[in-house]
C-alpha cells in the first residue's frame, strides 16, 4: 500500500490557511469536493463541501471555512480564516465519486496553530462577506456526506499553501511565513 504523507503547516492565531488542492481537470472538474479533519482513531469528519455539481469559481463558506473550485485550473482552494489554536489537526481534501470511494486529492495537512502575534492581518467577518454562505438551515441534501476511508491506492498529487488574507488572489507561488515539514507515516 502507498504510504500516506503529511505536510506540516505552522501558523499563528488569526492567520489564514490557504491550501490549493490539485485534481485531474478532465475527470473531476464538476465533482463535489470536501474538506475533512481526521483525528486519531476516528472517522474522518466532513467540515465543508462544495455544491453538487461543483460550480466553477463559486465560493462556498461554512463558518470560517471557504471552498472555491477552479475548474479551469483543476484545483480546489480551501481557506480557513481567523485560525484558532483549536483548529490544529490533520486535514485532507477529498473528491466524491459515488458509488466509488472518495479520492484523496493530496498529502494530508498537519496544521499547527499557535498563539502569538500574526504578521498578516487577522481575518474577520467583513473580509468574507462577498462569498456565498450556506444558510443556517443547511440540510444533508446540500452536503451529502460520502465517506473517505483511510486507504489510498495511488500517490496523491502535491499541494501548495499560502498564508494570506481571505480576499487574496489565487497565487500558487507566493508561500510566505510558513514552515513545511514533510512527515512520513
Amino acid at each position: 500500500a502507498t504510504k500516506l504523507t503529511e505536510e506540516k503547516y505552522e501558523l499563528k492565531e488569526g492567520q489564514t490557511l490557504d491550501v490549493k488542492c490539485d485534481y485531474t481537470l478532465e475527470k473531476f472538474a464538476s465533482s463535489q469536493k470536501a474538506w475533512q479533519i481526521i483525528r486519531d482513531g476516528e472517522m474522518p469528519k466532513t467540515l465543508a463541501c462544495t455544491e453538487r455539481p461543483s460550480k466553477n469559481s463559486h465560493p462556498v463558506q461554512v463558518g470560517r471555512i471557504i471552498l472555491e473550485d477552479y475548474h479551469d485550473h483543476g484545483l480546489l482552494r480551501v481557506r480557513m480564516v481567523n485560525l484558532q489554536v483549536e483548529d490544529s489537526g490533520l486535514y485532507q481534501c477529498v473528491i466524491y465519486q459515488p458509488p466509488k470511494e472518495p479520492h484523496m486529492l493530496f498529502d494530508r495537512i498537519r496544521l499547527v496553530v499557535t498563539k502569538g502575534f500574526s504578521g498578516t492581518p487577522g481575518s474577520n467577518e467583513n473580509s468574507t462577506q462577498n462569498v456565498y454562505k450556506i444558510p443556517p438551515t443547511t440540510t444533508k441534501a446540500l452536503c451529502p456526506l460520502y465517506t473517505s476511508p483511510r486507504t489510498v491506492t495511488q500517490a496523491p498529487p502535491k499541494s501548495t499553501a499560502d498564508v494570506s488574507t481571505p480576499d487574496s488572489e489565487i497565487n500558487l507561488t507566493n508561500v510566505t511565513d510558513i514552515i513545511r515539514v514533510p512527515v512520513f507515516n
Epitope: 472517522m43 474522518p44 469528519k45 463558518g63 470560517r64 466524491y96 470511494e101 443547511t138 456526506l145 476511508p149
Partner: antibody
Framework: QLQLQESGPGLVKPSETLSLTCTVS??????????WGWIRQPPGKGLEWIGS???????YYNPSLKSRVTISVDTSKNQFSLKLSSVTAADTAVYYC????????????WGRGTLVTVSS | DIVMTQSPDSLAVSLGERATINCKSS????????????LAWYQQKPGQPPKLLIY???TRESGVPDRFSGSGSGTDFTLTISSLQAEDVAVYYC????????FGGGTKVEIK
C-alpha cells in the same frame, strides 16, 4: 426502503465470544455515503457505541471496548458482523446495528435490536 | 472521553404543555471552524430502537414533527417539545460525535 436486521445467538456463556450479524436489505451496504455501526443497551440503561465499519473495511472502535471487538463486512452478502470476545454478565444487552451518516457520526436508521444474555 | 449528562432523569408534563430536556457535555462539541455542534437527539419508545430527531444540535431529521426543536451550543443543549402529545412518551437521548461517540444517560418523558 432500507432495513437493518440483527441476528445471532440470544445466549452466550461467560468468557466466550459473542457473534452477531446485521443484514442490510432494500439497499446496498457498499454505498459510499455511510458507515455501519453497532450500539448496545444494557437492560434499563443507556446507549453505548461499540464501533463502526465502512464497506471497504475501515473500522473504528470505542476505545473502552477496542481490545475485545472485531467488526467485519461482507459486501457480497450485504452484511456486517460484530464479534465481542471474553464476555461477562456486564455485556448482557440489546445489540443494535445502525446506519451512520459519515462526517457527522449520528445514526439515522436502526435495526430493531436483539437481546444477548451472557450467562452460564 | 466526552461525558454527556442529561437532566432531569425523568419529566412529567401535561398534554399540550412544553417539555424541556437538557444535555451538558464535559467538553465543547462545537467545531468553531465550520460553526457546527456535533450533537444529536434521539427518541426511544418502549420496545423500539432509538429514532433520530435532531442532528447538528438544531437540524430536524426529515419527517420529524416541528414541535421538536433543538438549541444550544458548545457544552449546553436543550431539546424542546413545544406541545406534548401522547405519542411523545419515550426516553430521549443526546449523543455527541465531536470526539468519539458518546450518549447521555437518557431522560424519560411521561404524561402528568
Amino acid at each position: 426502503q432500507l432495513q437493518l436486521q440483527e441476528s445471532g445467538p440470544g445466549l452466550v456463556k461467560p468468557s466466550e465470544t459473542l457473534s452477531l450479524t446485521c443484514t442490510v436489505s432494500g439497499g446496498s451496504i457498499s454505498s459510499s455515503s455511510y458507515y455501519w455501526g453497532w450500539i448496545r443497551q444494557p437492560p434499563g440503561k443507556g446507549l453505548e457505541w461499540i464501533g463502526s465499519i465502512y464497506y471497504s473495511g475501515s473500522t473504528y472502535y470505542n476505545p473502552s471496548l477496542k481490545s475485545r471487538v472485531t467488526i467485519s463486512v461482507d459486501t457480497s452478502k450485504n452484511q456486517f458482523s460484530l464479534k465481542l470476545s471474553s464476555v461477562t454478565a456486564a455485556d448482557t444487552a440489546v445489540y443494535y446495528c445502525a446506519r451512520q451518516e459519515y462526517g457527522d457520526g449520528y445514526f439515522d436508521l436502526w435495526g430493531r435490536g436483539t437481546l444477548v444474555t451472557v450467562s452460564s | 472521553d466526552i461525558v454527556m449528562t442529561q437532566s432531569p432523569d425523568s419529566l412529567a408534563v401535561s398534554l399540550g404543555e412544553r417539555a424541556t430536556i437538557n444535555c451538558k457535555s464535559s467538553q465543547s462539541v462545537l467545531f468553531s471552524s465550520n460553526n457546527k455542534n456535533y450533537l444529536a437527539w434521539y427518541q426511544q419508545k418502549p420496545g423500539q430502537p432509538p429514532k433520530l430527531l435532531i442532528y447538528w444540535a438544531s437540524t430536524r431529521e426529515s419527517g420529524v414533527p416541528d414541535r421538536f426543536s433543538g438549541s444550544g451550543s458548545g457544552t449546553d443543549f436543550t431539546l424542546t417539545i413545544s406541545s406534548l402529545q401522547a405519542e411523545d412518551v419515550a426516553v430521549y437521548y443526546c449523543q455527541q460525535d465531536a470526539t468519539g461517540i458518546t450518549f447521555g444517560g437518557g431522560t424519560k418523558v411521561e404524561i402528568k
